[in-house]
């Protein structure tokens, strides 16, 4: 039950996280014009990974894509790459984790296979989250550097007569979305890895024990599976489903209402 909950919650958290990473990557507000301590302009600038936009006070917004690859800063390219890698890994992780979910039954898939898939998806989510956090952090660092550089030469002028106010950029909404989303994906991945441990069948080496009861013998073998008749002592808080004695967390049957998170 706890494993199912952990796995299900990990999946949901990762799903939200990856949706957030996609949203952040597509958003135009990675950097926004700094309005603090600046003259009030009738134009507001903001930039994303793919295009830059200008919103006029008239309400008109114009966005222009970065129609060059070679002309873009290497850091921006790196951020793009990190975010895309994060999305791709996250998407694959989601696909894998869907089949690994304990509450979903696919043929006669073994628990060990589900455990491996859960671990794989968990690792993918962790790497995806780290990619997103790294990408957003690199961009944020770039912004901070540029901010202080432009603050140093805030006003550039010709002989001090004419002043040109440099547009400074600060953190946009996409950065916060990216950080939160990356964190959620990371947490989801950790939860999947934790769930994997509970999903893996216990390889406890119990000695084979023979019980004699009025000429009718029931042998329990080390794997925990019932070997012969349909009755026997349900030791170690085991439940019997479909002729198989397994721990509550190992049961691979149609889920009861309690199996859903």
């Amino acid at each position: 039950m706890a494993v199912t909950a952990c796995q299900g919650l990990g999946f949901v958290v990762s799903l939200i996280g990856i949706a957030g990473i996609i949203a952040a990557t597509c958003m135009d507000q990675w950097s926004t014009q700094d309005l603090y301590n600046n003259p009030v302009t009738a134009v507001f600038n903001y930039q994303g990974l793919w295009r830059s936009c200008v919103r006029e006070s008239s309400g008109f917004t114009e966005c222009r894509g970065y129609f060059t690859l070679l002309g873009l800063p290497a850091m921006l390219q790196a951020v793009r790459a990190l975010m895309i890698v994060g999305i791709v890994l996250g998407a694959i992780g989601l696909l894998v984790s869907i089949f690994a979910l304990k509450c979903i039954r696919i043929g006669s898939m073994e628990d060990s296979a589900k455990a491996n898939m859960t671990l794989t998806s968990g690792i993918m989510f962790i790497v995806s989250g780290l990619c997103a956090i790294a990408g957003v952090s690199v961009f944020a660092n770039m912004l901070v550097t540029n901010f202080w550089m432009s603050t140093a030469n805030m006003y550039t002028g010709m002989g001090g007569m004419v002043q040109t106010v440099q547009t400074r950029y600060t953190f946009g909404a996409a950065l916060f979305v990216g950080w939160v989303a990356g964190g959620l994906t990371l947490i989801g991945g950790v939860m999947m890895c934790i769930a994997c441990r509970g999903l893996a069948p216990e390889e406890t080496n119990y000695k084979a024990v023979s019980y004699h009861a009025s000429g009718h013998s029931v042998a329990y073998k080390p794997g925990g599976f019932k070997a012969s008749t349909g009755f026997g002592s349900n030791t170690k808080n085991k439940k019997i489903y479909d002729g198989g004695a397994r721990t509550e967390d190992e049961v691979q049957s149609y889920p009861s209402k309690h199996d859903y998170v």
Partner: antibody
Framework: EVQLVESGGGLVKPGGSLRLSCAAS????????MSWVRQAPGKGLEWVST????????YYADSVKGRFTISRDNAKNSLYLQMNSLRAEDTAVYYC???????????WGQGTLVTVSS | DIVMTQTPLSLPVTPGEPASISCKSS????????????LTWYLQKPGQSPQLLIY???TRESGVPDRFSGSGSGTDFTLKISRVEAEDFGVYYC?????????FGGGTKVEIK
């Protein structure tokens, strides 16, 4: 056809109040930023105030800040300018205008005269 | 506040001749985000409301004859009329549309010579 019609002007004593209205038609009023511009007799144009389309932002000239209030009613397609503590130097023709591309005032009303005199 | 300085104050022109009006701003009106200059030109004919001629320093408003052209960047701007016609007489204003308050120039009166 875009139309802006101002009303509410007239003679008022110094320290008095007046409310100007501007009825808009022929365009999407709720999606447009609107402005008031005035022109004192025989003088040049002076920007007074601007209100953004969503009603979120209002801007004022230093000369009217704290005395004038710009507002809008998108349901009625109307723009307003509430003028309090009026002074003789507020005497002017007040124009209502729509902001277009480049924040330029692309459509203007015919203007309404406000005279502040004792 | 941004100060907009227009020259000349008055410009006597013979119809058919070219005319040029200068406008200088105390701060650059160039927006780095889209590389556009937020400088607008208006014409106010006697007894009429102002009408928009040019925005973004060089983009003609629809319906404005192509004899009107705007140029300049940063702080120095120019409005040119290739051949002045009778309906072009009036007062021309430039306006800063970048910084609040959105200040106007003092105006240039284009009159018949």
């Amino acid at each position: 056809e875009v139309q802006l019609v101002e009303s509410g002007g007239g003679l008022v004593k110094p320290g008095g109040s007046l409310r100007l209205s501007c009825a808009a038609s022929g365009f999407s009023f709720s999606n447009s930023a609107m402005s008031w511009v005035r022109q004192a007799p025989g003088k040049g144009l002076e920007w007074v105030s601007t209100i953004s389309s969503g009603d979120s932002y209002t801007y004022y000239a230093d000369s009217v800040k704290g005395r004038f209030t710009i507002s809008r009613d998108n349901a009625k397609n109307s723009l307003y300018l509430q003028m309090n503590s009026l002074r003789a130097e507020d005497t002017a023709v007040y124009y209502c205008a729509r902001q277009g591309y480049g924040n330029a005032l692309d459509y203007w009303g015919q203007g309404t005269l406000v005279t502040v005199s004792s | 506040d941004i100060v907009m300085t227009q020259t000349p104050l008055s410009l006597p022109v013979t119809p058919g001749e070219p005319a040029s009006i200068s406008c200088k701003s105390s701060q650059s009106l160039l927006n780095s985000g889209n590389q556009k200059n937020y400088l607008t030109w208006y014409l106010q004919k006697p007894g009429q409301s102002p009408q928009l001629l040019i925005y973004w320093s060089s983009t003609r408003e629809s319906g404005v004859p192509d004899r009107f052209s705007g140029s300049g960047s940063g702080t120095d701007f120019t409005l040119k009329i290739s051949r002045v016609e009778a309906e072009d007489f009036g007062v021309y204003y430039c306006q800063n549309d970048y910084y609040y308050p959105l200040t106007f120039g003092g105006g240039t009166k284009v009159e018949i010579k």
